[in-house]
């Protein structure tokens, strides 16, 4: 996988009036490493790993850059003509990548009320607009405004990409995204019994890199896909990931089942707890992933936040 740096910015308008401030997140190699504190108007580290490795200068620079980007996005939102009453959002996702062969990519994507209307390749300056008439209108609106704005020249796009790549290289050198291996912690829990069946859940947490195999086995043989339910592999905010797999088994057959995990050349099998352990663990069956921080703001405002 290539190394990547991604910024996610959003501005809001209420009844035609663009709200002050903006929302922002930064991801390094898919891991959240930056959040923008709207109250303090500062970029801050997300997770201990970013805090430990990246110095104060990083957050000063990121604050300046995000403030400028946020202002640009707010000005762009003011020029979107079709704003009816109610709450509206304009979101920009900017990504730059360094691939294994040292080639680079850069792009940015714009969403209005959660709908993609414009994608730009920062290296070729090519734009892509979805077929819908709404997207076409929005894209024309925005690009016309940019044409009037001297800053939005080809040189500006090139600088934008160069700046992003420069940061990415600096962060990688700082060791934030060192390709270290952190083996998963695996635990198996059982839910309440219903109709003689038990739901067994196997959770892997705090692992890096992201790729993992997690599957239930019966008598040493993998269960078929349609008898298992998998959770997404999600960042846990500490530079590592978490995921889960669940299946239903007949009560009394616990000994036949193991959770098999394979990660970065290591593997392990984890049995289903039985007897007292089964009862003790039975409460820990929540399969829902709760989003914290910025996402709560978007959810509260019923705004679709594109990852």
């Amino acid at each position: 996988e290539p190394h990547s740096l991604r910024y996610n910015l959003m501005v809001l308008s209420q009844d035609g009036s663009v709200q002050s401030g903006f929302l922002a997140e930064g991801h390094l190699d898919g891991q959240p490493f930056l959040r923008y504190d709207r109250q303090k108007r500062r970029a801050k580290p997300q997770g201990q790993w970013a805090e430990d490795v990246l110095g104060a200068k990083t957050w000063d620079t990121e604050t300046e850059d995000l403030t400028e980007n946020g202002q640009d996005l707010r000005r762009t939102l003011t020029h979107i003509k079709d704003q009816k009453g109610g709450l509206h959002s304009l979101q920009e996702i900017r990504v730059c990548e360094i691939h294994e062969d040292s080639s680079t990519r850069g792009s940015r994507h714009f969403y209005y009320d959660g709908e993609l209307f414009l994608s730009q390749n920062l290296e070729t300056q090519e734009s892509t607009v979805p077929q819908s008439s709404r997207a076409q209108t929005l894209a024309m609106n925005v690009t016309n405004f940019w044409k009037e704005d001297a800053m939005k020249t080809k040189t500006h796009y090139r600088a934008m990409q160069a700046d992003c790549l420069q940061k990415l290289q600096r962060y990688l050198k700082s060791g934030v995204a060192i390709r270290r291996t952190v083996p998963p912690m695996v635990n198996v829990t059982c839910s309440e019994v219903s109709e003689g069946n038990i739901t067994v859940t196997c959770r892997a947490s705090s692992f890096y890199p992201r790729n993992i195999t997690l599957t239930w086995r019966q008598d040493g043989v993998s269960l078929s896909h349609n008898t298992q339910q998998w959770g997404d592999v999600l960042p846990d905010g500490n530079g590592t990931y978490q995921t889960w797999v669940a299946t239903r088994i007949r009560q009394g057959e616990e000994q036949r089942f193991t959770c098999y995990m394979e990660h970065s050349g290591n593997h392990g099998t984890h049995p289903v707890p039985s007897g007292k352990a089964l009862v003790l663990q039975s409460q820990r069956t929540d399969h829902h992933h709760h989003h914290h921080g910025l996402n709560d703001i978007f959810e509260a405002q019923k705004i679709e936040w594109h990852e």
């Epitope: 008598d219 040493g220 593997h267």
Partner: antibody, heavy 118, light 107 residues
Framework: QVQLQQSGPELVKPGASVKVSCKAS????????IYWVKQSHGKSLEWIGY????????VYNQKFKGKATLTVDKSSSTAYMHLNSLTSEDSAVYYC???????????WGQGTLVTVSA | DIQMTQTTSSLSASLGDRVTISCRAS??????LNWYQQKPDGTVKLLIY???RLHSGVPSRFSGSGSGTDYSLTISNLEQEDIATYFC?????????FGSGTKLEIK
């Protein structure tokens, strides 16, 4: 390729015990279960039990509980089956087998003949 | 325990014949049925797993079918090297159980 090499034939006296070994090669030993199967002369196959080499967890056929004990030595990638209090009924060929994670008894050892005779 | 019955203990066929070996379980085994080949020297190989899935390296002349309690193994074009005893085995319920075997001979 996956190979299971079993120990040689054993001639043992009634009441004695025997330990049959099964050395695995060609794959990561702790990834897959080792199963044991008995075949009495001219008869069908009977499943004895299995062991998970990663954590030593065992599951036995009720019929062989107390008769067979399954163990592994991870350092030598070897599985063992210990049979105790032997009688003529225990005279048989014993097979070890492993899985590829998709089917039971995917690969088999060549078998070990155990003869119980006074 | 689930009983696995192979009613035909031995079967004679000519080279090139289509041969079917059947196996019945004493209760529904939900397709968890495997077939093994045991050569006269005692060597055992997996042929078919989960009723009809061909194990890698097994010639395509072998096929499996069935459901519920009734299953069969078919050899579409019998070859000399197929002379062996064939066992069915259920993997649905512990203890795993095998059929008594069907010995295949050449006419």
């Amino acid at each position: 390729q996956v190979q299971l090499q079993q120990s040689g034939p054993e001639l043992v006296k009634p009441g004695a015990s025997v330990k049959v070994s099964c050395k695995a090669s060609g794959y990561a030993f702790t990834k897959y279960n080792i199963y044991w199967v008995k075949q009495s002369h001219g008869k069908s196959l009977e499943w004895i039990g299995y062991i998970d080499p990663y954590n030593g967890g065992t599951v036995y056929n009720q019929k062989f509980k107390g008769k067979a004990t399954l163990t592994v030595d991870k350092s030598s990638s070897t599985a063992y089956m210990h049979l105790n209090s032997l009688t003529s009924e225990d005279s048989a060929v014993y097979y070890c087998a492993t899985t590829d994670g998709y089917s039971l008894f995917t690969y088999w050892g060549q078998g070990t003949l155990v003869t119980v005779s006074a | 325990d689930i009983q696995m019955t192979q009613t035909t203990s031995s079967l004679s066929a000519s080279l090139g014949d289509r041969v079917t070996i059947s196996c019945r379980a004493s209760q529904d085994i939900s397709n968890y049925l495997n077939w093994y080949q045991q050569k006269p020297d005692g060597t055992v190989k997996l042929l078919i797993y989960y009723t009809s899935r061909l194990h890698s390296g097994v010639p395509s002349r072998f096929s499996g079918s069935g459901s519920g309690t009734d299953y069969s193994l078919t050899i579409s074009n019998l070859e000399q090297e197929d002379i062996a005893t064939y066992f069915c085995q259920q993997g649905n319920t512990l203890p795993f159980t095998f059929g008594s075997g069907t010995k295949l001979e050449i006419k």
